[in-house]
């Protein structure tokens, strides 16, 4: 009955503070409406980073002010988180909810440790 969600263990953000990873879920049924939420866990505190609900076959739409973008393909969601800084290094959990049709299922990944390294400032050039 439990829905399995897989995501990479570790991802390194690029120099522009962007990190991408795939969240894949094993759907027990044929869901038509799916909600994907990215959560950040730090010191046992969990906070929402972003969330999007989408109809299967359609694109993910995050809110305009979201730091996340994404695309979906079957039971895979390709997530990108932007604007990350060193202080944002942490465990990012992918949560998937099959909202419709019944029954409802929820799946939680083990989390992706995202490492963010702030770029060194460029030295002044004469």
């Amino acid at each position: 009955k439990a829905m399995h969600v897989a995501q990479p263990a570790v991802v390194l953000a690029n120099s522009r503070g962007t990190a991408s990873f795939v969240c894949e879920y094993a759907s027990p049924g044929k869901a038509t409406e799916v909600r994907v939420t990215v959560l950040r866990q730090a010191d046992s505190q969990v906070t929402e980073v972003c969330a999007a609900t989408y109809m299967m076959g359609n694109e993910l739409t995050f809110l305009d002010d979201s730091i996340c973008t994404g695309t979906s393909s079957g039971n895979q969601v390709n997530l990108t988180i932007q604007g990350l800084r060193a202080m944002d290094t942490g465990l990012y959990i992918c949560k998937v909810e099959l909202m419709y049709p019944p029954p409802y299922y929820m799946g939680i990944g083990n989390g992706t440790q995202i490492y963010v390294i702030d770029p060194e400032p460029c030295p002044d050039s004469d």
Epitope: K1, M3, T53, M99, Y104, G107, I108
Partner: antibody, heavy 118, light 108 residues
Framework: QVQLVESGGGVVQPGRSLRLSCAAS????????MHWVRQAPGKGLEWVTF????????YYADSVKGRFTISRDNSKNTLYLQMNSLRAEDTAIYYC???????????WGQGTLVTVLE | EIVLTQSPGTLSLSPGERATLSCRAS???????LAWYQQKPGQAPRLLIY???SRATGIPDRFSGSGSGTDFTLTISRLEPEDFAVYYC?????????FGQGTKVEIK
């Protein structure tokens, strides 16, 4: 701090209706799914119904399907339970509960008592 | 529907003793989706453990959860007077959400 406060309970005759409310505060209501759970006198916990973030998706226990309707007003931070065709076996304390980020019911209201009797 | 069966129905123990409560599921429940709640008379349930073994905020470390698949356990290492209550397990991975019938931990 997170607070859930139920209201609307009372004594009602079989076949009649009642509407429960749950006022939420201390968190972004629209970012959480919500539930109603009930507990008959001296008995255990029974899940009743669930509603999604935007209110578009609702699930019900078989025992209340077709009689109870869950709804929410995100602009008022309030969850509702419309109970029609009430039966004696619906007598219980009704709790609203918030779904935590990782799935468990992390906050509960204090409950409101519904008594259905002749 | 996943049926959860708790045992024993009642546990009679003295303060300072260890309490072991069992919850068995009719089919496999992912460990990420099993919770334990405590309920005292006249009060709402309170979340103790989620994800089978993670303690909720503010829960003392004498409470611990374990298990996977169909068999889960809540352990209270040393019972304090305030721990005498009814304990419920719950699965929340799929609808309908279900609870066990409860285990009452009473003072011997």
């Amino acid at each position: 701090q997170v607070q859930l406060v139920e209201s609307g309970g009372g004594v009602v005759q079989p076949g009649r209706s009642l509407r429960l409310s749950c006022a939420a505060s201390g968190f972004t209501f629209s970012s959480y799914t919500m539930h109603w759970v009930r507990q008959a006198p001296g008995k255990g916990l029974e899940w009743v119904t669930f509603i999604s973030y935007d209110g578009n998706n609702k699930y019900y226990a078989d025992s209340v399907k077709g009689r109870f309707t869950i709804s929410r007003d995100n602009s008022k931070n309030t969850l509702y339970l419309q109970m029609n065709s009430l039966r004696a076996e619906d007598t219980a304390i009704y709790y609203c509960a918030r779904t935590g980020w990782l799935g468990p019911f992390d906050y509960w209201g204090q409950g409101t008592l519904v008594t259905v009797l002749e | 529907e996943i049926v959860l069966t708790q045992s024993p129905g009642t546990l009679s123990l003295s303060p300072g003793e260890r309490a072991t409560l069992s919850c068995r599921a009719s089919q496999s429940v992912g460990s990420s989706y099993l919770a334990w709640y405590q309920q005292k008379p006249g009060q709402a349930p309170r979340l103790l453990i989620y994800g089978a073994f993670s303690r909720a905020t503010g829960i003392p470390d004498r409470f611990s959860g374990s298990g996977s698949g169909t068999d889960f356990t809540l352990t209270i290492s040393r019972l304090e007077p305030e721990d005498f209550a009814v304990y419920y397990c719950q699965q929340y991975g799929s609808s309908p959400w279900t609870f066990g019938q409860g285990t009452k931990v009473e003072i011997k």
